[in-house]
């Protein structure tokens, strides 16, 4: 089935430069590898900036979005750009930095229930056609008041892991990103290699939970590289703990 080809873990344990929480320590889920390009630009600095090509926002880091670098530029040439801060113009939620969302074309501050601010509200910002086909995943439009004060539960649409309740992370599933459970000890994970083929990942698992890392299962050491089973295992040492 497609599932066997596409199923994978694509979160914390990616080695640079393919991403992972190392580049964005505040992010529970790293950039989701995309069909066209794997990973996102995880080491963007003013002094050493290397544009990272992308097809969707989710291929970029938590503090980035995917767009043409020039206004009205060629939609076929898209890179990961730094997110827009408060009061900057936007066209979609993913363009705004964490802690903000796009409302009426402007990045505005949000509390932890940020994506509830769109209740029954149509935002139809128009900036011409730039970015019109580059839109990524939005925080959930919560249309039910019962969910107004709760973070995303399992299966809820999300943009970032901060949209999800504790113990969950935001990961790709089919054509959306949803809140899924963080992996527990013994659960299967996939540790991507630097030059691995991530092109078809549309099913993602969360990262391994705190105190765990994605490692080859001991009794699978003799297996061929392609069939090595990775599971979430306890750290032998106390470094690299991950906080949700």
């Amino acid at each position: 089935t497609l599932n066997s080809v596409l199923n994978s873990n694509a979160i914390k344990n990616l080695p640079p430069p393919l991403g992972g929480a190392a580049g964005h320590p505040g992010s529970a889920v790293s950039a989701a590898p995309g069909i066209l390009y794997p990973g996102g630009n995880k080491y963007q600095t003013i002094d050493n900036y290397q544009p990272y090509p992308c097809a969707e926002d989710e291929e970029c880091g938590t503090d980035e979005y995917c767009a043409s670098p020039t206004r009205g530029g060629d939609a076929g040439v898209q890179i990961c750009l730094a997110c827009r801060k408060r009061r900057k113009r936007c066209m979609r939620h993913a363009m705004c930095c964490p802690g903000n969302y796009c409302k009426n074309g402007i990045c505005v501050s949000s509390d932890q229930n940020h994506f509830r601010g769109e209740i029954e509200e149509t935002i139809t910002e128009s900036f011409g056609n730039d970015h019109s086909t580059l839109d990524g995943y939005s925080r959930r439009t919560t249309l039910s008041s019962k969910m107004y004060h709760t973070k995303g539960q399992e299966g809820s649409v999300c943009l970032r892991s901060s949209d999800c309740a504790s113990g969950l992370c935001c990961a790709r599933h089919f054509w959306s990103k949803i809140c899924k459970p963080v992996l527990k000890e013994g659960q299967v994970c996939t540790k991507h290699r630097r030059k691995g083929s991530h092109g078809l990942e549309i099913f993602q698992r969360c990262y391994c939970g705190e105190g765990l890392s994605c490692r080859i299962q001991k009794d699978h050491h003799q297996a061929s590289n392609s069939s090595r089973l990775h599971t979430c295992q306890r750290h032998h040492h106390h470094h690299h703990h991950h906080h949700h």
């Epitope: 069909i35 796009c102 649409v157 099913f203």
Partner: antibody, heavy 117, light 111 residues
């Protein structure tokens, strides 16, 4: 209020083409995935195509190569270009989106496509 | 693809009675710690409406009398006390694998 309104259905001969549209309102269209689901007369539901917020497309084998899903975020619109139509494509076509969870949680009222000679 | 089989095909009940609808998958629809099973209600001439997702979570604005349960391959939709407006066709749908597939439906009719 979330609204999805389909249009473009009609009668077409086998082998013909038709383009369906779905006008969306009440949510930030450009940020969400959206899909087409169809229902043949007196039958169950069948997924037809989906497109992610960023424009990635997905199809079942039954329509791959014949149908093309696309979106125009500037117009808050979804489209389904249907070519090489067959009698078995006769159905009510719904656009549906996933705003709150991964399931199809909001649906339009549908547009009817009849393929017959 | 995952095949979903719903039973019974038709359920004849009276208002106020309890309805129990079954959906069986040809393989497990559990993954990532979630049961990717959804339930929809459809009335004649209308679009489907999401009732339950992730096996047991209620969709927005869905009355509490609708509940879902199950995991793996066997799932149940329960309507605790049928209201007149609940007589309709109910479909299960899996989202574990592409393509997403639907069951054949269960018609709940007035006895």
């Amino acid at each position: 209020e979330v609204q999805l309104v389909e249009s473009g259905g009609g009668l077409v001969q086998p082998g013909g083409s038709l383009r369906l549209s779905c006008a969306a309102s009440g949510f930030t269209f450009s940020s969400y995935a959206i899909s087409w689901v169809r229902q043949a007369p007196g039958k169950g539901l069948e997924w037809v195509a989906s497109v992610s917020g960023g424009g990635r497309t997905y199809y079942p084998d039954s329509v791959k190569g014949r149908f093309t899903i696309s979106r125009d975020n500037a117009k808050n619109s979804l489209y389904l270009q249907m070519n090489s139509l067959r009698a078995e494509d006769t159905a009510v076509y719904y656009c549906a989106t996933s705003l709150e969870n991964y399931a199809f949680d909001y649906w339009g009222q549908g547009t009817t496509v009849t393929v017959s000679s | 693809e995952i095949v979903l089989t719903q039973s019974p095909a038709t359920l004849s009940l009276s208002p106020g009675e309890r309805a129990t609808l079954s959906c069986r998958a040809s393989e497990s629809v559990d993954d990532f710690g979630i049961s990717f099973m959804n339930w929809y209600q459809q009335k004649p001439g209308q679009a489907p409406r999401l009732l339950i997702y992730a096996a047991s979570k209620q969709g927005s604005g869905i009355p509490a009398r609708f509940s879902g349960s199950g995991s793996g391959t066997d799932f149940t939709l329960t309507i605790s006390s049928l209201e007149p407006e609940d007589f309709a066709v109910y479909y299960c749908q899996q989202s574990k694998e592409l393509p997403p597939t639907f069951g054949g439906g269960t018609k709940v009719e007035i006895k």
